[in-house]
Structures are given as structure tokens and as C-alpha cells.
């Protein structure tokens, strides 16, 4: 079956996360919960099944420094992932289109 338009993947996913989370930064995977030993990452959640803004926001880093696990910096990138200069991210119109698509 063809993937629904609500899926996000590749650079579009990274850009949309950057837009949604802003200065907070974000994680590509959340720590596994006590209930589930397996950590499901943003790619599994958004590339291969439908994804919404609420779900994306759960991958944002916690705003307050005191609440964040300081041992793991925000925007945790996988091995061999290109490090993007922050200045390259500002494509507001593109992100706006992606987030509007997710709101529908």
C-alpha cells in the first residue's frame, strides 16, 4: 500500500522536528520505558506509519535544563549522521507546509 501523505522521512523529517522543537533541540530516539524495553525511534514512528504534530513534540528535548538529562545533549544524531550548521535550517515556508500537512 502506498504510504499516506502524513508520513515524514529524510531531510523533511529532520527539518520538521527542528521547526517543531525550536531551540529545545530534539532526540531521534526516546529512552525505552519500563513497560517496553525496546526504544522506538522517530524514524519508525514517522517514516513507516502516519505521524502527527503531537507525536513529533514528544521527541523534543525538555525545555528546562534542570529537567533534562544533561548527560545526553539534545539533537542526538545517529552514528555517521551529517552535522548541520544551525544556520542552514531556516526554511520556514517549507516547514510550515510540512506541519500544516500533519495538522490535517
Amino acid at each position: 500500500a502506498y504510504r499516506p501523505s502524513e508520513t515524514l522521512c529524510g531531510g523533511e523529517l529532520v527539518d520538521t522536528l527542528q521547526f517543531v522543537c525550536g531551540d529545545r533541540g530534539f532526540y531521534f530516539s526516546r529512552p525505552a520505558s519500563r513497560v517496553s524495553r525496546r526504544s522506538r525511534g522517530i524514524v519508525e514512528e514517522c517514516c513507516f506509519r502516519s505521524c502527527d504534530l503531537a507525536l513529533l513534540e514528544t521527541y523534543c528535548a525538555t525545555p528546562a535544563k534542570s529537567e533534562r538529562d544533561v548527560s545526553t545533549p539534545p539533537t542526538v544524531l545517529p552514528d555517521n549522521f551529517p552535522r548541520y550548521p544551525v544556520g542552514k535550517f531556516f526554511q520556514y515556508d517549507t516547514w510550515k507546509q510540512s506541519t500544516q500537512r500533519l495538522r490535517r
Partner: antibody
């Protein structure tokens, strides 16, 4: 040394099947998503499919959807491409490639390719 | 799908020449644009990723620039081993797509 080695190509009749393999070495295979990219003789590059690091997610080009299946065995460090209902237009050199494509990254390691010829 | 258009499709250059190849995306892709070199009978190899980042081990005579829809690969002083075909590729969204290629030949 980081290396990808494809095998399984050959001559097959239209409508036939073939299974390609890609053996990975020199890196932690289970941490990377993997892709297949093909190149018809004298033509450009065409992305075929990607599989997530765990093997739980896949995406295909429209041209192969429903006919090709990408899979992996992380315990064997091997990537596969099962090709069914082959057509003449599937004739190409098939490359496996490592990349961070699901995160917007590039193909940083390529295999040497395996040739698939579909002809009667 | 995002279409990638490369130009020129081929060009002739002499050793030492400055060569510029352009790539245009059918819609904005931020800087998610990669460049590959392919020599005859060989697999492609990555040169530049995210528009301007030089892959480790690639000579500094290669450079990339651009953002949005328009991108450029420049070889500041072409060397004999640079005569090959070059492809751009977007990694902004799936399906991933490549440009048609630019063949750089010896004049």
C-alpha cells in the same frame, strides 16, 4: 576496512525471480539503514529501496513496488533484495549502499555492484 | 516526487580548468543535496553531502554550494582522475532521486 559485496546477479527470463545479497563488513551493520540503487546500461542512477536498521520499516520506488522485497539479517550482516516478476526494464547493475537516508543523509559506502539481465 | 535536473549533460575540459556543474530541484530541499562521482565501470563514490560538506578523503579542489532549489558542484582545477560522470541526489524526501548525470570529458 568498510566494505559491501553484492552477489546473486545473472541472466533471468521475463517474469522470473532473482535474489540479490549484499555482505557487509568493517562496520556495525545493525546500526545503519541500507539501500539498493540500480543503474541501467548507459543510464543514470535510480534509487530502488531502503530498509531501516532494525528491518522493521521499508520504502520502495514506485517502479518496483509489489514486485521487489528488501530484507536484512543483522545476525549475518547481510542485506537482500528479492526480485519477482522481473521485466526487461529491470536490467541494470544493482548496488547496495550504506547511508543515513532516512535522516536526510547521503550514501557514503557503495558495493561494487552485481549485474542483473532480464531477457528471453 | 522531486525531480532533479543537472546541466550540462556533458562538458569538455582541459587539465587545470575550472569546471562548474549545476543541479536544480523541482521543489525546495533545504541543503539535502549530495554529489557523487562515477568513473567508467566503477561504483559511485560520495564527494559532497548536505550541499557543501566535503566527504573525508575527497580532494579540496571539489566544492559544493547552494540551498533551496539551486546547487553547484565546482572543481577548481580539474585533474586527469576527475574525468568521470557526476550525479546530484536529493535526500529531502522519498523516493530519493538523482540528477541525470554530467559527463566530464577531456578536451
Amino acid at each position: 576496512e568498510v566494505q559491501l559485496l553484492e552477489s546473486g546477479g545473472g541472466l533471468v527470463q521475463p517474469g522470473g525471480s532473482l535474489r540479490l545479497s549484499c555482505a557487509a563488513s568493517g562496520f556495525t551493520f545493525s546500526k545503519y539503514e541500507m539501500d539498493w540503487v540500480r543503474q541501467a546500461p548507459g543510464k543514470g542512477l535510480e534509487w530502488v529501496s531502503v530498509i531501516s536498521s532494525s528491518g522493521g520499516g521499508t520504502i520502495y520506488a514506485d517502479s518496483v513496488k509489489g514486485r521487489f522485497t528488501i530484507s536484512r539479517d543483522n545476525s549475518k550482516n547481510t542485506l537482500y533484495l528479492q526480485m519477482n516478476s522481473l521485466r526487461a526494464e529491470d536490467t541494470a547493475m544493482y548496488y547496495c549502499a550504506r547511508g543515513r537516508t532516512l535522516y536526510g543523509g547521503a550514501f557514503d559506502i557503495w558495493g561494487q555492484g552485481t549485474m542483473v539481465t532480464v531477457s528471453s | 516526487d522531486i525531480q532533479m535536473t543537472q546541466s550540462p549533460s556533458s562538458l569538455s575540459a582541459s587539465v587545470g580548468d575550472r569546471v562548474t556543474i549545476t543541479c536544480r530541484a523541482s521543489q525546495p530541499i533545504n541543503t539535502y543535496l549530495n554529489w557523487y562521482q562515477q568513473r567508467p565501470g566503477k561504483a559511485p563514490r560520495i564527494l559532497i553531502y548536505t550541499s557543501s560538506t566535503l566527504q573525508s578523503g575527497v580532494p579540496s579542489r571539489f566544492s559544493g554550494s547552494g540551498s533551496g532549489t539551486d546547487f553547484t558542484l565546482t572543481i577548481s582545477s580539474v585533474q586527469p582522475e576527475d574525468f568521470a560522470t557526476y550525479y546530484c541526489q536529493q535526500s529531502y524526501s522519498f523516493p530519493l532521486t538523482f540528477g541525470g548525470g554530467t559527463k566530464v570529458e577531456i578536451k
